[in-house]
Interface confidence: low
């Protein structure tokens, strides 16, 4: 019968033949008696077989990740007989990886939204990488993820490829951020190939900053002619945060006369100081009224950063209007 | 090689102001955050600031809000520090330091500081 | 009053490993990277351990840094004669929402 061993060529052999192993029939004697043949898909191109000996060699370079097995069969035919001495079987012959293959990552680009101030070990986005070389042989496959930039902000987890934060940041004073992973394979032993991707990682806005009156006293005048319902003037806060989340309401916190009212222009996010009742400039010729802004929409667990509204004090002028 | 050069020593009386300067080199001027350090004389060192020189933003320490501005020119990349209304116990060495780009990034590269005296 | 809290001096002799202690507390140290700066006399501060236990290139191997809890420590072997300087640590403060220095520890190195 046929005396089979296991076949391997390593792919990417430089050498212009590599010596795959032996045909050998056990009714072989060795007095060359014997030919050897070689047929299927890659006899007599990639592979070659040395017909009085059954000795197998690869001729060309293979590339396992192109095709990583080649299905043959042998033949033994007695020469002087002309006969088959084994009957033709079929065998394998496989190709070994060597690490040729850097990680890659397919899902490219990578672009993430975590809103700011997460806590540490927030999960900010998962990148994979993938390997053309073969998972069961060795550590060729296998790999490890680091971050090359991004640092202290986020942190990667080496065998998911999991992003998390790792410190606190602030959209305030920076709203987006590159973060530079790399995934090595070999699990990171000498020899390892890499490859790198980039992930933006925005931070989404929350409502960590109220909103601060720009002036802390306001002048405003009205004349005593007016009616009730008059803007006599606007007041302006601040709020470094964005969208909703600097959205405010005016409201008067201390007006003992009660003669005005402020209400919020939601488009400007100013405040209108309006004439609640008539004044009479003989009766009172000014006032003196303070007005508090907080923001519109303040989320249970924010509500340590809004704890004490802003306020400003308006001082209000009465033009006193000649009466007939 | 990177560098933070400041302006050169002043002497103020109680109630003036003074503006310090800090010209950068050797480096990107909007990559970096740029912060104020003081120590009066004999004593420990105590942050002032920080200033974003790319967004303007800026955050100042509590003890110094009302009274510290600080502020950047991009054509010179120069960032400006300055201090109002001065008492003696402002009295110190001003350092500018570079930050990183998050504000808890320790300071990498330090200005040679600049002396400012406040007496009558 | 510092809100991180360091000796304030410390003495050795040439050869030998001192240690600089630096307490604070969650809102600090607790909660943030811990760095250590050394000033030389007459000189601004120069960055000697960030991020807890990391050197900048230039700076000896004989300079380590840690971080427990609420406390850091700068350790110091081989002690030189051009070790003597102040030495300072420093961290963010996330309820001062700025940073905060340790008032410093002199380091005097006994011939």
């Known amino acids: 019968g046929w005396v089979w061993n296991q076949f391997f060529v390593p792919e990417e052999m430089n050498t212009t033949s590599h010596h795959v192993g032996r045909l050998r029939s056990d009714l072989d004697n060795g007095n060359n008696s014997f030919q050897y043949k070689l047929l299927g898909a890659g006899a007599g191109s990639t592979f070659i077989i040395d017909e009085r000996t059954g000795d197998i060699y690869a001729i060309e370079k293979l590339d396992r990740e192109e095709r990583s097995l080649y299905i043959l069969r042998a033949q033994v035919i007695d020469i002087t007989t002309g006969r088959a001495v084994e009957p033709e079987s079929e065998f394998v012959i496989k190709v070994s990886d060597i690490n040729d293959n850097e990680p890659k990552f397919l899902d490219e680009p990578y672009e993430a939204i975590v809103p700011e101030m997460s806590p540490e070990g927030t999960l900010v986005i998962q990148v994979t990488a993938s390997d053309a070389d073969d998972p069961s042989s060795g550590n060729n496959a296998r790999l490890l993820y680091s971050l090359l930039q991004g640092q202290p902000y986020f942190s990667v987890e080496p065998t998911t490829g999991v992003i998390r934060i790792s410190s606190k940041m602030d959209r305030e004073l920076q709203d987006e951020y590159w973060v530079i992973i790399q995934a090595k394979d070999m699990i990171g032993q000498p020899g390892a190939l890499s490859g790198t991707t980039s992930v933006l990682i925005k931070l989404s806005d929350v409502n960590d900053n109220k909103p601060i009156f720009k002036e802390s006293l306001y002048r405003l005048t009205v004349s005593e002619s007016a009616p009730t319902g008059t803007s006599i003037g606007t007041i302006m806060a601040y709020d470094n945060d964005i969208g909703e989340n600097a959205e405010m309401d005016y409201s008067i916190e201390e007006d003992d006369s009660q003669t005005f009212d402020i209400i919020t222009n939601h488009e400007t996010q100013e405040g209108i100081v309006i004439l609640k009742k008539k004044v009479n400039f003989e009766h009172q010729n000014h006032y003196g009224i303070r007005a508090k802004v907080k923001n519109h929409h303040v989320d249970e667990q924010l509500m340590k950063y809004h704890t004490e509204a802003s306020t400003t004090f308006i001082k209000i002028q009465v033009e006193d209007v000649d009466e007939p | 090689q990177v560098q933070l050069v400041q302006s050169g020593a002043e002497v103020k009386k109680p109630g003036a102001s003074v503006k310090v300067s800090c010209k950068v080199s050797g480096y990107t001027f909007t990559s970096y955050f740029i912060h104020w350090v003081r120590q009066a004389p004999g004593q420990g060192l105590e942050w002032m600031g920080i200033i974003n020189p790319i967004s303007v933003s800026t955050s100042y320490a509590q003890k110094f809000q009302g009274r510290v501005t600080m502020t950047r020119d991009t054509s010179t990349s120069t960032v400006f520090m300055e201090l109002s209304s001065l008492r003696s116990e402002d009295t110190a060495v001003y350092y500018c330091?570079?930050?990183?780009?998050?504000?808890?990034?320790?300071?990498?590269?330090w200005g040679q500081g600049t002396l400012v005296t406040v007496s009558s | 009053q510092s809100a991180l809290t360091q000796p304030p001096s410390v003495t050795g002799t040439p050869g030998q490993r001192v240690t600089i202690s630096c307490s604070g507390s969650?809102?600090?140290?607790?909660?943030?990277?811990v760095n250590w700066y050394q000033q030389l006399p007459g000189t601004a501060p120069k960055v000697l351990i960030y991020?807890?236990?990391q050197r900048p290139s230039g700076v000896p191997d004989r300079f380590s840094g840690s971080k427990s809890g609420t406390s850091a420590s700068l350790a110091i072997s081989g002690l030189q004669s051009e070790d003597e300087a102040d030495y300072y640590c420093?961290?963010?403060?996330?309820?001062?929402?700025?940073?905060?220095f340790g008032g410093g520890t002199k380091l005097t190195v006994l011939s």
């Open positions: 991020t807890n236990n």
């Open positions: 420093a961290t963010w403060d996330d309820s001062m929402n700025g940073w905060v």
């Open positions: 969650r809102s600090n140290i607790g909660s943030n990277f």
């Open positions: 330091a570079r930050g990183g780009i998050q504000l808890w990034l320790h300071l990498d590269y």
